[in-house]
Interface confidence: low
Amino acid sequence: EEELQVIQPDKSVLVAAGETATLRCTATSLIPVGPIQWFRGAGPGRELIYNQKEGHFPRVTTVSDLTKRNNMDFSIRIGNITPADAGTYYCVKFRKGSPDDVEFKSGAGTELSVRAKPSAPVVSGPAARATPQHTVSFTCESHGFSPRDITLKWFKNGNELSDFQTNVDPVGESVSYSIHSTAKVVLTREDVHSQVICEVAHVTLQGDPLRGTANLSETIRVPPTLEVTQQPVRAENQVNVTCQVRKFYPQRLQLTWLENGNVSRTETASTVTENKDGTYNWMSWLLVNVSAHRDDVKLTCQVEHDGQPAVSKSHDLKVSAHPKEQGSNTAAENTGSNERNIY
C-alpha cells in the first residue's frame, strides 16, 4: 500500500483581519493510525494550533467530522483572524505510539497572510500657532496594517502636497506595520477654513482610503490689520475716533486706547463679525473731549492678539481746528465693539 501523504493544497491563504481562515489538509490514507495536529511554524519552537486528540482550542473548528473512521479531511477553520495569526501552518500526521504519539509526516505548509486594515490616520499639527507664510509640520500616523505595502498622500483643501517624508516600520518582516509621515505646509491668510488631510490607501480598503484631518484653524494665527480713522464730530467739543481691526484669527484680542501715551481704555473683542474666510473683524471707537486738551493729541490703538506682542496704529488729532458738528453718531460713549462685516 502507498505510504500516506499529507496534502496541503494551498501554498498560501490571504485573509482579512476579523474574518475566518480555512486551512485545508487531506491525507491519502487512513494508516498509519494516529491523530492530526496543526502547528504554526516549524522546528522546536513551533506553536500548537489544534490537536485532534486532546486540548481546548476555542477559535478552531474542523471542516469535517473527525470522529468518522473514514475521515481523511483534516482541514480547520480559525476564526477572528488578527495580524498576530500570520505565519506558516503545518498539518502534521502522527503515528499512534506508546507512551507518546510519534510524528509521522508533515504537509508542505500553508502560509497565512493577514490583511489588516490600517487604523484611522491621526494627524497632529504643531504645538504653537504660526502666522501666514510660515511653514509648519504635520504628522500622520497609522498602525496595525498588513501587508506592508501602503500608500500615503497629503492634501491641503483637496490639493495634493509634495513636501513630505514617510517611514514604514519595522523594516523587516512583521505581523503588522506602522506608518509615520511628516508633511510641511506653508500657511496662507485664507487658511482658517483649510484642512490638511492625510490619506492612506491599502489593499484592505478596497479603493476607499482612510483619511485623517487637521483643521488649520487650530494652527494658524492671522495677525490683524489696524486702521484708525477720525469720524465726523459728535458734538462741538467731541471727536469720534475709530480703530478698525480687520481679518484676524483666532478671536482672542485685547485693544487698548492710548491718549498721548496714557492708557485711556482697554477692552476685549467680544461681538466680532466673521468673514467668509473665517477671519474676524472688529471695531472700537473712542470719544475724545477736545476741550480737555490744549495741545494736539496723539491717539494710539494698541492691539494684543492671541498673546502676541502688541501692534499699534496712531492718529494725530489736531485740537486747534476741529470741524463743526455734523450730526450725532449712533455709537455709545466709551464702548466700542461694533460688528464689522462677514466674508
Epitope: T188, R189, E190, T225, E227, R246, K247, T273, N275, K276, D277, N281, N338, E339, R340, N341, I342, Y343
Partner: antibody, heavy 119, light 105 residues
Framework: VTLDESGGGLQTPGGGLSLVCKAS????????MAWVRQGPGKGLEYVAE????????YYGSAVQGRATISRDNGQSTVRLQLNNLRAEDTGTYFC?????????????WGHGTEVIVSS | AVTQPASVSANPGETVRITCSGD????YSWHQQKSPGSAPVSVI????DRPSDIPSRFSGSASGSTATLTITGVQAEDEAVYFC???????????FGAGTTLTVL
C-alpha cells in the same frame, strides 16, 4: 475712496469683455473687491468677488463658468473677464470695495461702466 | 431670496423704516441709488455700520433673518431707491433685494 471702472461699451453676443477697476485713496491690498451689475430697469446683481490677496475668487450663479476675476495689488486694479456674452449681460457694471467680503460688506462703489451686448 | 417693500413714503422729519427679510441671511448692507444706472452709495454695511461720510440719521439693525434701515428725521435729499444686500450663510450666496423706493412727500 475712488473706484474708477473702464472697459464698457458695445459688445457682440458670444464675444468677451474685460472690465478694469482702478482704485485709489485706500490700501487696496487690504480689501476684497467685487463687481456688481445692474440691468436696464432692474435691480442689483452680484457678479464676482476676489479676496484681498487675489487667491480666492467667488462668482455669482449667472456668470459662473464664464467669468474670471483677478487683481493686481501693485497696480491697485481689479479685472473682470466675461466670456460668451449674452443679451442679459447688458447693464452697468459697478466696482465695489468690500470691507470684509460679500455684498453685506460693500462700503464703497465706483461710478460704473455701461456694457451693451447687442448684434 | 430677500424681500423688501416696493415703496415707502414719509413726510420730512419723520422716521422711516425699511425692512429686508431673507431665508437665513445673517448679514446685510443698505445702498442708496438716486437714479437707475447711477452709482449707488452705501449707507449701512454689516447690518449696523455706517460709512464715515453718511449722516447719522441713517442707522441699521438686524434681528434673526430680518434687517431694518432706519432714517430718523428723513429729508428731501433722502428720496431714492434703497437696495438691501444680503449674504446667505447657509447657501454661501450673495443677493440683493429688488429695491424700495422712498418718497419724501
Amino acid at each position: 475712496v475712488t473706484l474708477d471702472e473702464s472697459g464698457g461699451g458695445l459688445q457682440t453676443p458670444g464675444g468677451g469683455l474685460s472690465l478694469v477697476c482702478k482704485a485709489s485713496g485706500f490700501d487696496f491690498s487690504n480689501f476684497n473687491m467685487a463687481w456688481v451689475r445692474q440691468g436696464p430697469g432692474k435691480g442689483l446683481e452680484y457678479v464676482a468677488e476676489i479676496s484681498d490677496t487675489g487667491s480666492t475668487p467667488y462668482y455669482g450663479s449667472a456668470v459662473q463658468g464664464r467669468a474670471t476675476i483677478s487683481r493686481d495689488n501693485g497696480q491697485s486694479t481689479v479685472r473682470l473677464q466675461l466670456n460668451n456674452l449674452r443679451a442679459e449681460d447688458t447693464g452697468t457694471y459697478f466696482c465695489t470695495r468690500n470691507f470684509g467680503s460679500s455684498v453685506s460688506s460693500i462700503d464703497a462703489w465706483g461710478h460704473g461702466t455701461e456694457v451693451i451686448v447687442s448684434s | 431670496a430677500v424681500t423688501q417693500p416696493a415703496s415707502v413714503s414719509a413726510n420730512p422729519g419723520e422716521t422711516v423704516r425699511i425692512t429686508c427679510s431673507g431665508d437665513s441671511s445673517s448679514y446685510y448692507s443698505w445702498h442708496q441709488q438716486k437714479s437707475p444706472g447711477s452709482a449707488p452709495v452705501s449707507v449701512i454695511y454689516s447690518n449696523t455700520d455706517r460709512p464715515s461720510d453718511i449722516p447719522s440719521r441713517f442707522s441699521g439693525s438686524a434681528s434673526g433673518s430680518t434687517a431694518t434701515l432706519t432714517i430718523t428725521g428723513v429729508q428731501a435729499e433722502d428720496e431714492a431707491v434703497y437696495f438691501c444686500g444680503a449674504y446667505d450663510s447657509s447657501s454661501d450666496s450673495d443677493i440683493f433685494g429688488a429695491g424700495t423706493t422712498l418718497t419724501v412727500l
